[in-house]
Interface confidence: low
């Protein structure tokens, strides 16, 4: 009688499309890109942490989010050399089961943590610009820190499947040791569930919130400019809003599309080895795009602020932070910020948006 899923050893079988995603140029190009991302990311995000924590003394809601964004990126970046070696060795995993689980969870964790943090940052920008007075009590350092703890817990929860189901397997007829998900062939709910969760929870919902937040900011600022027709219009703010939304969208959309195609393959809707090859070949490339842009996010958001830019350049010139806390750092704003007095509904003031992680 049928005995399904009784092979409990670490041996597994190679498949119908054994060459899918296995190309010499991938084994050279991807490790090279991973190495570049690692160097640039570690350097950039470490400086962001130093600037926000030591120079700017972590005084604003947005700086809390940006600091956590940089820390999440650093957690991911530390595992990137393992993936570079794994790809260079033609998907052979030499680091053991424990590091397989940790490295896999790190990738998943970074995706969710960074996307959730960017979503919260967009909500914070909306509250700061559109409702600066009303949101003052809500936009506190305590709320920001609790929000970050919740985000880390949620990202950790989303990474649990990787910790549980990612394992090192020896593929019998090809003599390859891989770090991969495994699940019963007759029960593909795990890969489908993980893929769709990544699509919906890791992209669709956050993108809709980010889009809504910045659209409402856009409308509020447009309204403010219309009230003061005699004042010169500053189009930079609108360009920055567009840049934020488009940067997020185009960073993640390739990876999300191929993740969805991957789900269709798991479901058996796509049954073509050529498409499987395209998906498996493109996947690491889309990971490079998404995670490289992701690692640039703290710099991208930070450099929108004059103070951040100044401290960052100061740090590059080895100028140490002042021992005394900066008195001119107010707790009100951050990226895409207004002075508290510059309520957009006020017709007496000129909207003076400045993109600061103050």
């Amino acid at each position: 009688i049928l005995n399904s899923s009784t092979e409990d050893g670490i041996k597994r079988i190679q498949d119908d499309c054994p060459k899918a995603g296995r190309h010499n140029y991938i084994f050279v190009m991807i490790p090279t890109l991973y190495s570049i991302i690692f160097v640039v990311g570690i350097f950039g995000n470490s400086l962001v942490v130093i600037v926000i924590y030591f120079y700017m003394k972590l005084k604003t809601v947005a700086s809390v989010f940006l600091l956590n964004l940089a820390l999440a990126d650093l957690c991911f970046l530390l595992t990137l050399p393992l993936w570079a070696v794994y790809t260079a060795m033609e998907y052979r995993w030499p680091f053991g089961n424990y590091l397989c689980k940790i490295a896999s969870a790190s990738v998943s964790f970074n995706l969710y943590a960074s996307v959730f943090l960017l979503t919260c940052l967009s909500i914070d920008r909306y509250l700061a610009i559109v409702h600066p007075m009303k949101s003052r009590l809500r936009r506190t350092m305590l709320v920001a820190k609790v929000t970050c703890i919740i985000i880390w817990l949620l990202a950790g929860l989303a990474s649990l499947p990787a910790i549980i189901h990612r394992n090192v397997f020896f593929i019998e007829n090809t003599n390859i040791t891989v770090c991969a998900f495994h699940y019963e062939s007759q029960n593909s709910t795990l890969p489908i569930g993980l893929g769709l969760t990544k699509n919906i929870l890791g992209f669709l919902f956050p993108f809709l919130i980010i889009l809504t937040s910045y659209t409402l900011i856009w409308k509020a600022l447009k309204k403010a400019y219309e009230i003061q027709k005699n004042k010169p219009r500053n189009d930079d703010i609108f360009k920055i809003i567009m840049a934020i939304v488009l940067f997020f969208f185009f960073s993640w959309i390739p990876h999300q599309i191929f993740t969805f195609l991957d789900v269709l393959i798991q479901l058996g809707i796509i049954r073509d080895c050529r498409i499987a090859d395209i998906v498996d070949t493109a996947m690491p490339i889309t990971i490079c795009i998404a995670y490289f842009n992701n690692c640039l996010n703290p710099l991208f958001y930070g450099f929108l602020g004059k103070k951040f830019k100044r401290y960052f350049l100061q740090l590059l010139k080895y100028i140490p932070p002042k021992a005394k806390s900066h008195s001119n750092l107010s707790t009100k704003m951050s990226t895409l910020s207004y002075r508290p007095s510059d309520n957009v509904s006020s017709s007496t003031k000129k909207p003076a948006p400045c993109f600061e992680v103050e």
Epitope: I13, Q14, D16, G21, Y91, S185
Partner: nanobody, 122 residues
Framework: QVQLQESGGGLVQAGGSLRLSCAAS????????MGWYRQAPGKEREFVAG???????NYADSVKGRFTISRDNAKNTVYLQMNSLKPEDTAVYYC????????????????WGQGTQVTVSS
């Protein structure tokens, strides 16, 4: 319900031939890659040969050139033609059905038959 049923095993002299058959249920046959594994006494189960839905085949190095795997779609049956048998081919041969369409970086558990004994005497 029996979903994988092997037959054709037996005792054969070294250098002889045998043909193993594996009848699969329609559901499994249409969706899964079919293959043969074997387990000699006191040894681990090892891969012998596999055939995809698209008839792509692969073999263990130890049987290449001697064994041939094929499938008959009309009968939902997979065959393993074993020629030039050696005493070291003595084992219980298992029919296996594994996932229809995983790819190179994702691997799956398998369905197993009950096994059929093949004994090669010298």
């Amino acid at each position: 319900q029996v979903q994988l049923q092997e037959s054709g095993g037996g005792l054969v002299q070294a250098g002889g031939s045998l043909r193993l058959s594996c009848a699969a249920s329609d559901y499994i046959y249409r969706r899964y890659r079919m293959g043969w594994y074997r387990q000699a006494p006191g040894k681990e189960r090892e891969f012998v040969a596999g055939i995809g839905v698209g008839t792509t085949t692969n073999y263990a190095d130890s049987v290449k050139g001697r064994f041939t795997i094929s499938r008959d779609n009309a009968k939902n049956t997979v065959y393993l033609q074993m020629n030039s048998l050696k005493p070291e081919d003595t084992a219980v041969y298992y029919c296996a059905a594994y996932n229809y369409f995983p790819r190179s970086i994702v691997y799956y558990y398998v369905y197993w038959g009950q096994g059929t004994q093949v004994t090669v005497s010298s």
